[in-house]
Each structure stands twice: as structure tokens, then as C-alpha cells.
Interface confidence: medium
């Protein structure tokens, strides 16, 4: 969690001098409770903003915005911490409002946004506005939160922000899968224009479970550059067991924007459904999928006794 | 050249646990699953299950479900099998092996004596 | 679970001899069988794969045949090396199995 590399954050407005401070999230009202206190934000609003940075680099930003309620309490209020919370890392980052000037009745109600809050694709949030002093112990809340989802790099305005691109969001590998003879399945990928390896993994499972029966991976090494948009074919020697015929077939790109990290796509072979009447054909009703990015780095188990190896398609 | 070595001989207490360590060497581990046999004295082979390096899997015996736990640490090329609640027919030599459907390298075995 | 049973349990054969044990399936495993070779205070040592495909490093004395639910494990000309235990072992499902042994023994 970050901010956006911006100019200088602003949170004033007519009738309100305003600065925005880092914040630790623990305000001071916390350990030193005051007697008057504000009420919570209202309409809380989050919403998917798209910034660039002083470099021009696009970044997805949660778009924050709220309202104040129209009581006396206003009069009490000091500013507001903003705290984000990345709900799969405990991860939090916080900024403070802080009042300069006292608030005074107007005719608008009063509004407040924030706009520099960097998310990454995919994640999930969860955005708090307290108004500040927070309260006394045992006093009414007045904060208030909502969960914000950020889309994948599949999303089309996703897709081109800086994180998703140097993902590898633009790569469309067109995974095709066809089953063989001798218990193999060849895939067959394109290339991007990149000369970096990539992983293609081989998950089975039972038809009538979601049991892992077997797992292979191949190592695809760097193509040449006249290799380039080519197309890639492995051939997977398939477990023995026939009932382990749902097939769950990952590549990964190690591009060195994103090394063990970058976007992997995905396919599905169903089991096939046999009939008195027909033979098995080469599957062809795979089902696309968009894998999330993989925190981890590590590349495991290959079982791929006479499997053969890839070669490019020209 | 492939080396599975496991850790050495234990001798435990019933209700107690034991974990058995089996560090591979001489081949990328994270391209072979790891499977678990034992052997009680005189007796013969038993599978005991098998851990996908790859995806983190597994596959378990059926009669120790619930007293098995196999696991992976890429970073040392090292598998572990932790079995709980032993009891005095645990008694055997345990032993890893590379591969998930046949095995082709055995560790050296691990004897572990469930007494009281 | 898939039974195997293999026949005899011990077998007496003399150097230079050949030695022929059996390995039955309860049910069709087709040809995914391995045969283990082990020596006592040993791992088992891998022979066969695939019902009768050689591992690394095997003498050609040692052949597999058989699919379906019915394999055999010949030693043509025992050595006195061979002297062991044999296993048979299916992985067409699981669990995978093993045969309860035999015992090849210097008659």
C-alpha cells in the first residue's frame, strides 16, 4: 500500500483550510479521549479512479468520498483519518485530515474526497473514515467502512494501467488443448515478444471429486526473437489412472517486468463424456480462465516419465 | 546423482508425534512429487500418501486420514511426514520416495519405535 | 482398494537357475505395475515399470510381463546378488498397493 507520487496533497476548500498528514492510525484522541465529539461520516463512496504519476505511469487509485451530516457536531470536528486496509495482508495505510479552521454552517452540505490511495488489481480493501477526536470509550462510532474490490488485469481499463502491463496484461497466449493418443495432451500457446522462459503446469483431477490425482511441469526456455508470436507446443505424458481425466493446464510467463509474478492464464479440460455411440475426439471445449498473480516463487512437481519435450511451431 | 536422505532412528511414546525429514539432492526437487511408504518389521511395503511439490496436494491412505500430514520446504529441498497419535503398530521403517505413481530413488529409511 | 497377491511366498531357486514369480490384481490394472527388488536392512531398489519396462540400471536378466490383472517377474539365470525379497506394486489406483512379497532364497 502506497500513496500516489503526487504534488502537494490538498484537502482545503472554501470556508476550510485543510492539510494532509501521514498518519500512524493511532490518533491522539485515542489515547486522550475528549469530552465533545463528532458524528460518523455519511455516504461513504468508493470508487475506481485512474491516476498517473509525475512519470506518466497509470495506477489504478480507491477514489474516497464522503459527506458530513448536517448536526452541531460539525462544530467538534478536527478532521479525519483515512485508514486502508488490504484485507489479504493485514497491510494498513493511513492519512490525516487535519482541520486548520473551524467548520461553519453553509448552505452546500459538506464534502470531503481523496484520491491517492494506490490498490492493486485484484485485491480487496477496506476503506474507514473516522472523524477525529474519535470517540470516548463506550461513545457512539463515528467512523464508517466499506469493502472495495478491486478489479483484475482481465478488466479493460485494468488492463492497461502500469501494474497490470508489467504483469503482462497485453499477452494473449490463445492456450489450445488436444488430447493424444498413449495418454498425452499437447497445448499449444503463442509466444509474447519476450525473450524469457516460461512454466506450463499440468493439474489432473478426479471427475467425481475435486481430488488431485497428478501434476506435471515444463520448463518452455527463452525463445529467439524470430520466435517471437510464435506458437509453443508441450506434450504432457498423462497419469495412468483413467478416472484422472479433469485437466487443469497453467502457463506462466516470466517476464522481466514481473519475473515470478506476472499474470498466468488458464484452461480447463473437462473429463470427456464417453457414449455407446462415439469415440473420445480431441478436446476442444476447453474453458478459458485468468489466473490471479502468485505470490509464490516456487515451481514444484513434474511425475513426466517419457513425456516429451516443446518445440516452436512455425 | 539423486539422494533422498532421511533423518535418523526416533523412539516415542504412544499418543506422542513424530516428524520424519527427507532432503532430496542431485535433481531440481520441484520437479518431482514425494511420496511416503512404510514397512513394519518382517512386514511388508505400505503407501502411505504423496505430496505434489508443485501445487502442495495431497493424496493420503485412507486409514491414516487424520493422523498424517505431509509437507514441503522448497527453499531446503526437504520433505516432511508428521504422523500424530502414534501407536505401537506404527512401529516401522519409513521411507520417502521420488515420484507420485512409481518410485524410482528411496530414501535410506527411518526407523521409528512407538513404545511405552 | 486394489488387492495384489503374489505367489509363492518364498521360492528356493539355485544359482545360475531361472525364477519366476507371480504377481495377481483383484481387479485390471492394465500395465501400470512396478517391481521392487529389497535386501534386508535396504530400501526397495526399483526393476520394472510400466509391467515390463526395465529401470535405470537393471540387468537385462530381469524382464516383466503380463497386464490386465495377472504379471510375472523372471531372473533368468539367478545370481547370487538376487537373493531377496521381491515386491509387485499397482498404480492404476488409488491406493496404490503392494503385493505381500516373495522371498527368493538359495536352495
Known amino acids: 500500500l502506497r500513496l500516489l507520487d503526487h504534488r502537494a496533497l490538498v484537502c482545503s476548500q472554501p470556508g476550510l483550510n485543510c492539510t494532509v498528514k501521514n498518519s500512524t492510525c493511532l490518533d491522539d484522541s485515542w489515547i486522550h479521549p475528549r469530552n465533545l465529539t463528532p458524528s460518523s461520516p455519511k455516504d461513504l463512496q468508493i470508487q475506481l479512479h485512474f491516476a498517473h504519476t509525475q512519470q506518466g505511469d497509470l495506477f489504478p487509485v480507491a477514489h474516497i468520498e464522503w459527506t458530513l451530516q448536517t448536526d452541531a457536531s460539525i462544530l467538534y470536528l478536527e478532521g479525519a483519518e483515512l485508514s486502508v486496509l488490504q484485507l489479504n495482508t493485514n497491510e494498513r495505510l493511513c492519512v490525516k485530515f487535519q482541520f486548520l479552521s473551524m467548520l461553519q454552517h453553509h448552505r452546500k452540505r459538506w464534502r470531503f474526497s481523496f484520491s491517492h490511495f494506490v490498490v492493486d488489481p485484484g485485491q480487496e480493501y477496506e476503506v474507514t473514515v473516522h472523524h477525529l477526536p474519535k470517540p470516548i470509550p463506550d461513545g457512539d462510532p463515528n467512523h464508517q467502512s466499506k469493502n472495495f474490490l478491486v478489479p483484475d488485469c482481465e478488466h479493460a481499463r485494468m488492463k492497461v494501467t502500469t501494474p497490470c502491463m508489467s504483469s503482462g496484461s497485453l499477452w494473449d497466449p490463445n492456450i489450445t488443448v488436444e488430447t493424444l493418443e498413449a495418454h498425452q495432451l499437447r497445448v499449444s500457446f503463442t509466444l509474447w515478444n519476450e525473450s524469457t522462459p516460461y512454466q506450463v503446469l499440468l493439474e489432473s483431477f478426479s471427475d467425481s471429486e475435486n481430488h488431485s490425482c497428478f501434476d506435471v511441469v515444463k520448463q518452455i526456455f527463452a525463445p529467439r526473437q524470430e520466435e517471437f508470436h510464435q506458437r509453443a507446443n508441450v506434450t504432457f505424458t498423462l497419469s495412468k489412472f483413467h478416472w484422472c481425466c479433469h485437466h487443469h493446464v497453467q502457463v506462466q510467463p516470466f517476464f522481466s517486468s514481473c519475473l515470478n509474478d506476472c499474470l498466468r492464464h488458464a484452461v480447463t479440460v473437462p473429463c470427456p463424456v464417453i457414449s455407446n455411440t462415439t469415440v473420445p475426439k480431441p478436446v476442444a471445449d476447453y474453458i478459458p480462465l485468468w489466473e490471479p498473480r502468485s505470490g509464490s516463487s516456487d515451481y514444484k512437481d513434474d511425475d513426466d516419465k517419457g513425456s516429451s519435450h516443446h518445440h516452436h511451431h512455425h | 546423482q539423486v539422494q533422498l536422505v532421511q533423518s535418523g532412528a526416533e523412539v516415542k511414546k504412544p499418543g506422542a508425534s513424530v516428524k520424519v525429514s527427507c532432503k532430496a539432492s542431485g535433481y531440481t526437487f520441484t520437479r518431482y512429487g514425494i511420496s511416503w511408504v512404510r514397512q513394519a518389521p518382517g512386514q511388508g511395503l505400505e503407501w502411505m500418501g504423496w505430496?505434489?511439490?508443485?501445487?502442495?496436494?495431497?493424496n493420503y491412505a485412507q486409514k491414516l486420514q487424520g493422523r498424517v500430514t505431509m509437507t514441503t520446504d522448497t527453499s531446503t529441498s526437504t520433505a516432511y511426514m508428521e504422523l500424530r497419535s502414534l501407536r505401537s503398530d506404527d512401529t516401522a521403517v519409513y521411507y520417502c520416495?521420488?515420484?507420485?505413481?512409481?518410485?524410482?530413488?528411496w530414501g535410506q529409511g527411518t526407523l521409528v519405535t512407538v513404545s511405552s | 482398494e486394489i488387492v495384489m497377491t503374489q505367489s509363492p511366498a518364498t521360492l528356493s531357486v539355485s544359482p545360475g537357475e531361472r525364477a519366476t514369480l507371480s504377481c495377481r490384481a483383484s481387479q485390471s490394472v492394465s500395465s501400470n505395475l512396478a517391481w521392487f527388488q529389497q535386501k534386508p536392512g535396504q530400501a526397495p531398489r526399483p526393476l520394472i515399470y510400466?509391467?515390463?519396462t526395465r529401470a535405470t540400471g537393471v540387468p537385462a536378466r530381469f524382464s516383466g510381463s503380463g497386464s490386465g490383472t495377472d504379471f510375472t517377474l523372471t531372473i533368468s539365470s539367478l545370481q547370487s546378488e538376487d537373493f531377496a525379497v521381491y515386491y509387485c506394486q499397482q498404480y492404476d489406483n488409488w491406493p496404490l498397493t503392494f503385493g505381500g512379497g516373495t522371498k527368493v532364497e538359495i536352495k
Open positions: 505430496i505434489s511439490t508443485y501445487s502442495g496436494n495431497t
Open positions: 510400466d509391467a515390463s
Open positions: 520416495a521420488r515420484r507420485q505413481l512409481y518410485f524410482d530413488y
